[in-house]
């Protein structure tokens, strides 16, 4: 993942230096937040792993990376990071395993740098469509964000809404076109059954899409033609039967791609001899060497690209009121 | 509690180099930028220059280009100016000094190096 | 360069005397800060943000000021006070101090 990093071998925790006897106060008031450590020189501030319920009030102006991992926010409220003067310098900002399952609209205002967010492992049962894009305007003012990481946001089924997960995630990100600039989107370990079909195409800028170890089926509805830009398709561990003509022939024409395709339960039969044929041609595909089938029972393990033609057939299948005699 | 111990007064030849030193104690070097100052006998205060450690980076004041080079090593704690080419114009007392960046600036300053140029 | 300049460069008071010295700046800053140096000394943080006292800093200083126009008060002198004042801009490069301010006690 590409969530911002630890940036400073040693941070200067917000507890004041001791003396050998009494501690000297220091001239100048830390500007630490309390259960945070920090280090001017990265602009970096650490709150992780401190069980914060909410976002500390005091955070110094100077902050560019901001952690806030292994807390309990539970909900980010609208203008969560919203300060005076505003945090203008804030880039990366970390809220990974923070139990956060509520993250309100505008959550994310008034930070005009911010390029990276990470909101990974958090039961996100409720994501206002409104979270990253501040308003509810057709069209919002672009956000400047760059990267969005959203890997593992799936809450437990008992704490979904009565609603559909992918639909809820995808209406953040497409509300208001605010993310039109981004450029990697993590969306691994959700669940996903499908990708709605309007979603890639309004994020034109993506570089690196993310959505390995779901449970994705089929991309035939999905279009990959808009994304020019695309560099990386992370698609394994997944469901993906077959990809179908449409979709190689999309992927054929980005001119930049690397795809993954690892570990998915490809059905080797007649319906798989066209991605069979592209495999053996294509580039595009990283490790194509390991695909193996997983069905029918006969193929299973075989290499796809050690198949041919002869061996992908399809047995024909009885209408129900035929198959009992 | 936070030190900034500086290396010992120096008399040196005109033309020659120097290489002061500025070891911190009480925090760690790297999570904050350091500034130095000079200040001739009885005069004002005069900003060299500012490092960031973590990052190396630097920013003088135009005025100390080429005079002066600041560096820093994370593993000692201590940050260093390098002062070249001395003339008698160089003489003064060096400060070290933590800069705050919330602040804009210094909190603590080091005792100063007094240098004197003198054939 | 952003020039500071402190008036007077020197001046007296008598203890329990109200003692103000004013720092103008060149340029427009959001903000200055204030040093106090004692003879064979190096500096201290004195006031910063303008009005704000540094630790320890007794009670009886205080600052104020905005834009091209900053200064320091002392609400009743004493003879600790004597010592030099440096007012700093820290906000554009280079960073400036005014020429200072000694204060001596008659």
């Known amino acids: 993942s590409s969530s911002p990093t630890s940036s400073a071998s040693s941070f200067s925790s917000s507890a004041p230096f001791l003396a050998s006897a009494v501690s000297a106060q220091p001239p100048l008031p830390d500007q630490c937040p309390a259960l945070c450590e920090c280090s001017e020189a990265a602009r970096t501030v650490k709150c992780v792993n401190r069980n914060l319920t909410e976002v500390p009030t005091d955070l110094p102006a100077y902050v560019r990376n901001l952690f806030l991992t292994g807390n309990q926010l539970a909900v980010l409220p609208a203008g969560a990071f919203a300060r005076r003067p505003p945090l203008a310098e804030l880039a990366a900002l970390n809220l990974s395993g923070s139990r956060l399952d509520e993250v309100r609209a505008g959550a994310f205002e008034h930070l005009p740098s911010l390029r990276q967010l990470d909101l990974s492992h958090n039961p996100l049962a409720d994501l206002s469509p409104f979270a990253f894009s501040g308003s509810n305007a057709s069209v919002s003012a672009p956000s400047p964000l760059v990267e969005l990481i959203l890997n593992h946001i799936v809450p437990p089924e008992d704490e979904r809404q009565n609603r559909s997960f992918e639909g809820m995630v995808v209406a953040a990100l497409l509300a208001g076109r605010a993310l039109q600039g981004l450029r990697r989107l993590e969306l691994a370990s959700n669940h996903f059954l499908y990708l709605p079909r309007d979603v890639l195409a309004q994020l034109p800028s993506l570089r690196h899409l993310d959505l390995s170890n779901n449970s994705l089926v089929s991309l035939t509805y999905v279009s990959f033609r808009n994304l020019t830009h695309l560099e990386s398709l992370h698609l394994e561990d997944n469901a993906l039967k077959v990809l179908h003509n449409g979709t190689l022939a999309e992927l054929q024409g980005l001119p930049h791609i690397r795809v993954f395709l690892d570990n998915n339960p490809w059905v080797c039969d007649c319906h798989m001899a066209d991605m069979v044929t592209w495999l053996k041609e294509t580039e595009v595909v990283q490790g194509k060497d390991r695909l193996t089938c997983a069905y029918p029972e006969k193929m299973r393990n075989r290499v796809l690209l050690e198949l041919n033609s002869a061996d992908l057939d399809c047995d024909p299948i009885l209408p129900p009121s035929l198959q009992t005699s | 509690e936070v030190q900034l111990r500086q290396s010992g007064p120096v008399l040196v030849k005109p033309g020659a180099s120097l290489k002061m030193s500025c070891k911190a104690s009480g925090f760690t070097i790297a999570d904050y930028y350091m500034t130095w100052v000079t200040q001739s006998h009885g005069q004002s205060l005069d900003w060299i220059g500012l490092i960031n450690p973590y990052s190396g980076e630097t920013t003088y004041n135009q005025k100390f280009k080429g005079k002066a080079t600041l560096s820093v090593d994370k593993s000692s704690n201590t940050a260093y100016m390098d002062l070249n080419s001395l003339t008698s114009e160089d003489s003064a007392v060096y400060y070290c000094?933590?800069?705050?960046?919330?602040?804009?600036?210094?909190?603590?300053w080091g005792r100063g190096t007094s240098v004197t140029v003198s054939s | 360069e952003n020039v500071l300049t402190q008036s007077p460069a020197i001046m007296s008071a008598s203890p329990g005397e109200k003692v103000t010295m004013t720092c103008s700046a060149s340029s427009s800053v959001s903000y200055m800060h204030w040093y106090q140096q004692k003879s064979s000394t190096s500096p201290k943080v004195w006031i910063y943000d303008t009005s704000k006292l540094a630790s320890g800093v007794p009670g009886r200083f205080s600052g104020s000021g905005s834009g091209n126009s900053y200064s320091l008060t002392i609400s009743s002198m004493e003879a600790e006070d004597v010592a030099t004042y440096y007012c700093?801009?820290?906000?554009?490069?280079?960073?400036?101090f005014g020429g200072g301010t000694k204060l001596e006690i008659k």
């Open positions: 000094a933590r800069w705050r960046l919330g602040y804009y600036a210094m909190d603590y």
């Open positions: 700093f801009q820290g906000i554009g490069y280079p960073y400036t």
